[in-house]
Amino acid sequence: MGSAALEILGLVLCLVGWGGLILACGLPMWQVTAFLDHNIVTAQTTWKGLWMSCVVQSTGHMQCKVYDSVLALSTEVQAARALTVSAVLLAFVALFVTLAGAQCTTCVAPGPAKARVALTGGVLYLFCGLLALVPLCWFANIVVREFYDPSVPVSQKYELGAALYIGWAATALLMVGGCLLCCGAWVCTGRPDLSFPVKYSAPRRPTATGDYDKKNYV
């Protein structure tokens, strides 16, 4: 596959991944109440996200509300907010870096420097995927740990929400897309990080006697 095709495919995957990450960040479905206790008088589902939580009553009536205060949130939600937003912003920066290094743009003159810019964009997307993966896995670990913790009351047990799965899919796309962008940059000029301009010196003129300098012979 040509480097341009790798570049386009990589960028498309990264853009879809970025969109997925924004969706995961905004959705109030990072954790969803687990139905384990059939004795609960009124069945209701609680969804919790990074910015708000929603309650769906048995009647189907749903109410969502943004959290009252950042302080009222647990440390892991605060950390997840910070890391996810950082990943979204980093992906935005990576987009401009990738476009600047793309073969179809003229922001940077074609050559090794342009390939290095494209490679940087790919690496940024890879890092962006890893950055987003941290809160997703940390959050999932807490939810699963509390689910199996016998000291946690049944009414407080949660299951993994749809936003986590969307987030994981998004990080996979960002990382695969980042790898493809790196590969595209690599193929483009052949190891752009190693391609430095080589200086060739002109052959030396013969001396007055017509002899060549001994240093010119190996």
Epitope: K48, D68, S74, T75, S151, V152, Q156
Partner: antibody
Framework: QVQLKQSGPGLVQPSQSLSITCTVS????????VHWVRQSPGKGLEWLGV???????DYNGAFKSRLSISKDNSKSQVFFKMNSLQADDTAIYYC????????????WGTGTSVTVS | DIVMTQSHKFMSTSVGDRVSITCKAS??????VAWYQQKPGQSPTLLIY???TRHTGVPDRFTGSGSGTDYTLTISSVQAEDLALYYC?????????FGAGTKLELR
């Protein structure tokens, strides 16, 4: 089961300080905040302050100068201290878990009846 | 501070009746209102938050409604165990403030 058990003196001398310990079970102080509310016949329910899961504290301005709330996550304990008590501080003092993300005390402790005399 | 006013200190009712307890905030609290029930010698228990969302395990005969400054707790069919003190609370801003309470008693 979510529980908040309180321990503290029933009788306090005027101008002395009040210390109450709230020991929680069924949830972690790393994940939930703990509110302090008092109830007196004259003034009804009064919110005093909250110790958030992250460690920061919010106080009711009317009590800020003489109130201190701290916690020990490892021991699942929250400590309440109020200085310079007067007769009108006679009340039942409650600790209550905060609803995750909101200024709503959802599960209340047993309460500590305090008489200033 | 936001003042929460419960106009009725006492409300008389009979088992099976529908009863509504009202609460008025001194300013718009945009549905950030909670309702508590307190039985004699017990701690308050949360019934409703966000003005209309029932807390886990609360029977569906308890419903909350309202917006802006006016809020209502309705018990569709009063049971003997519902005879208690009811408090409203705003969770719009700190300091959190409570109403003076409404005591529900048998007629």
């Amino acid at each position: 089961q979510v529980q908040l058990k309180q321990s503290g003196p029933g009788l306090v001398q005027p101008s002395q300080s009040l210390s109450i310990t709230c020991t929680v079970s069924g949830f972690s102080l790393i994940r939930y905040g703990v509110h302090w509310v008092r109830q007196s016949p004259g003034k009804g329910l009064e919110w005093l302050g909250v110790k958030w899961s992250g460690g920061s504290t919010d106080y009711n301005g009317a009590f800020k100068s003489r109130l201190s709330i701290s916690k020990d996550n490892s021991k699942s304990q929250v400590f309440f201290k109020m200085n310079s008590l007067q007769a009108d501080d006679t009340a039942i003092y409650y600790c209550a878990r905060g609803l995750d993300g909101y200024y709503v005390p959802d599960v209340w402790g047993t309460g500590t009846s305090v008489t200033v005399s | 501070d936001i003042v929460m006013t419960q106009s009725h200190k006492f409300m008389s009712t009979s088992v099976g009746d529908r009863v509504s307890i009202t609460c008025k905030a001194s300013q718009d609290v945009s549905t950030n209102v909670a309702w508590y029930q307190q039985k004699p010698g017990q701690s308050p228990t949360l019934l409703i938050y966000w003005a209309s969302t029932r807390h886990t395990g609360v029977p569906d005969r308890f419903t909350g409604s309202g917006s802006g400054t006016d809020y209502t707790l309705t018990i569709s069919s009063v049971q003997a165990e519902d005879l208690a003190l009811y408090y409203c609370q705003q969770h719009y801003s700190t300091p959190l403030t409570f109403g003076a309470g409404t005591k529900l008693e048998l007629r």
